[in-house]
């Protein structure tokens, strides 16, 4: 099946002054044997001999895709009018890396979007980025062979002391972020309360400011902002953060009630809702996906339930009235 | 101390039914969400049901969906599961869990055979 | 739903020696905001089930820290460092990233 339907009548292409009826004539009453289609490609009509003037569809395999046009005619001369078309990857290769980094998530292929992130053992940075994306057949930005980890300049300004703080004597006081911060820091997704805004900021500076008692900056997420899920996310956490109980340091980020703080990551992870522990009066009243009922959650159960992005609305705080 | 005893399960014929109790202690059972999970001979371990504090909510593996039933007396610190129209593959090991901020099947029972035939 | 594929199904080692047991799941389990929730138990004979690794590479309560966990997306490890009789039995990997929570058959370790 081919969507160029033949009628027979003369065409001329984009790029040549002659008819095909204006072709010279050459005895070819058999006409086209089977084409060669391009690597990674097949022929969608497959057969032995085509007629002139018959179209044959070049299709691509699974993970590949036609570039270029895709038809070949049947030449009266018993020979192919075909344009260059090539069955171009759609998904990108694992990269190969250093394996002092770990790609995260880890699968064989990734598709066209899909993003992977490099880290390193802790008190170690990717020297350079650490999130790439697949874009055609490639990683955008090109994904270097010699990057490698480097130590953390934050962990050997730190000390003893927490994140955002240097040693000073035998004290430890905040690190200034236009002196302390020239250095290369990994890019956190930052959210500022006062502006209403979100921006990616180098780890070194919002920690710097973060520890100078500046409530208002939130961490999103590691890497620099994005759209998407992770960033709606940090943004709805933020949000939901004000009622917590629970306000427990961890890495770059803050803990809330529905989430632990990961030991070997430092990072917050949610908790999964039958985690949640009854105790707490943050209550909400909420209505579940479709469901025309209400309920009484904590906030715990709340959290872990929009982390998990399922349907719900807040309908109120406090308990539900009926 | 955790702990959590499960009653003790039998030989059941197809299409019969059974209640399997658990008993809960060493903790406050009505802040806690509640699970039961089976170990069958021949598909291993497997989630069967969830049920929140006070027994609003719950949540069932589609394959017992209809035919179990999780509840909970939280005035007997007890878990139950109401199991009608049993099948040759609901035999198994029955185990009483009980969560933590670690994870969803932090502490379990000592577990009761549940053996469905004629 | 999702199946957790374990590799091997049995090993056999003498105490001392490092394991690396595999857990390999049909779909990827890092969810849309970077959680994984994978966990490792450890059924010794007779006994139910024990907690043993939580998201991915946290060590449970009371755990030695000769075990490890590793691992992102499709592909899981654990690790016993150096192993000793007394972790003899059956590994099985866990995940609640999607519903329904499912478990891999099980890895058997027996001491040689």
């Known amino acids: 099946f081919s969507i160029m339907e033949n009628n027979g009548q003369p065409c001329i292409n984009d790029d040549e002054e002659m008819k095909e009826v204006d072709l010279p004539e050459i005895e070819a009453d058999s006409g086209c044997p089977q084409p060669v289609p391009p690597e990674n490609g097949f022929i969608r009509n497959e057969k032995q001999l085509y007629l002139v003037g018959e179209d044959v569809e070049i299709s691509c395999l699974t993970g590949f895709e036609t570039v270029g046009y895709q038809y070949f005619r049947c030449l009266p001369d018993g020979t192919w009018r075909q344009g260059d078309v090539e069955c171009q990857r759609t998904e990108c290769i694992k990269p190969v890396v250093q394996e002092v980094l770990t790609i995260t998530p880890f699968q064989r292929l990734y598709r066209i979007g899909e993003s992977i992130e490099l880290t390193c053992p802790k008190g170690f940075v990717v020297a350079g980025p650490s999130r790439y994306t697949c874009q055609g057949n490639s990683w955008t930005p090109p994904i270097s062979n010699s990057l490698t980890c480097e130590k953390d300049t934050l962990t050997k300004l730190k000390g003893h002391c927490q994140l955002g703080q240097k040693q000073s004597g035998s004290e430890c006081i905040c690190m200034s972020p236009e002196e302390d911060c020239s250095h290369h820091s990994e890019d956190l997704c930052v959210f500022d309360t006062d502006s209403n805004d979100y921006f990616t900021s180098p780890a070194c500076k919002f920690l710097a400011e973060k520890c100078l008692n500046n409530q208002q900056l939130h961490f999103l997420h590691i890497g620099s902002c994005q759209d998407g899920r992770q960033l709606e996310w940090g943004l709805e956490r933020t949000r939901l953060s004000s009622n917590s109980t629970k306000k427990e340091s961890c890495g770059y980020d803050t803990c809330y009630d529905w989430e632990k703080c990961s030991a070997s990551t430092s990072k917050c992870v949610c908790l999964l809702p039958p985690q949640c522990f009854k105790g707490g009066n943050q209550l909400y009243c909420v209505k579940m996906g479709s469901s025309t009922s209400e309920k009484t959650l904590n906030i715990c159960e709340v959290g872990t339930i929009r982390c998990a992005n399922r349907k719900m609305e807040i309908l109120h705080p406090g308990k539900c009235l009926a | 101390e955790v702990q959590l005893v499960e009653s003790d399960g039998g030989l059941v014929q197809p299409g019969g039914s059974l209640k399997l109790s658990c008993a809960a202690s060493?903790?406050?059972?009505?802040?806690?969400?509640m699970a039961w999970v089976r170990q069958g001979p021949t598909k291993g371990l497997e989630w069967v049901a969830t049920?929140?504090?006070?027994?609003?909510?719950?949540y069932y593996r589609e394959s017992v969906k209809g035919r179990f039933t999780i509840s909970r007396d939280n005035a007997k610190n007890t878990l139950y599961l109401q199991m009608n129209s049993l099948r040759a593959e609901d035999t198994a090991v029955y185990y009483c869990?009980?969560?933590?901020?670690?994870?969803?099947?932090?502490?379990w029972g000592h577990g009761t055979l549940v053996t469905v035939s004629s | 739903d999702v199946v957790l594929t374990q590799t091997p199904s049995t090993l056999s080692v003498t105490p001392g020696q490092p394991v690396s047991i595999s857990c390999r799941s049909s779909?990827?389990?890092?969810?849309?905001?970077?959680?994984?929730?994978l966990y490792w138990y450890l059924q010794k004979p007779g006994q139910s089930p024990q907690l043993l690794i939580y998201?991915?590479?946290d060590l449970g309560s009371g755990v030695p820290n000769r075990f490890s966990g590793s691992g992102s997306g499709t592909d899981f490890t654990l690790k016993i460092s150096g192993v000793e009789a007394e972790d003899v039995g059956v590994y099985y990997c866990?995940?609640?990233?999607?519903?329904?929570?499912?478990f891999g058959a099980g890895t058997r370790l027996e001491i040689k």
């Open positions: 869990s009980r969560p933590s901020t670690e994870a969803l099947f932090a502490y």
């Open positions: 060493g903790f406050t059972f009505s802040d806690y969400y």
């Open positions: 049920i929140n504090y006070d027994g609003s909510s719950t």
């Open positions: 779909q990827s389990l890092l969810n849309d905001v970077g959680n994984t929730y």
């Open positions: 998201l991915v590479s």
């Open positions: 866990m995940q609640a990233s999607h519903a329904p929570y499912t």
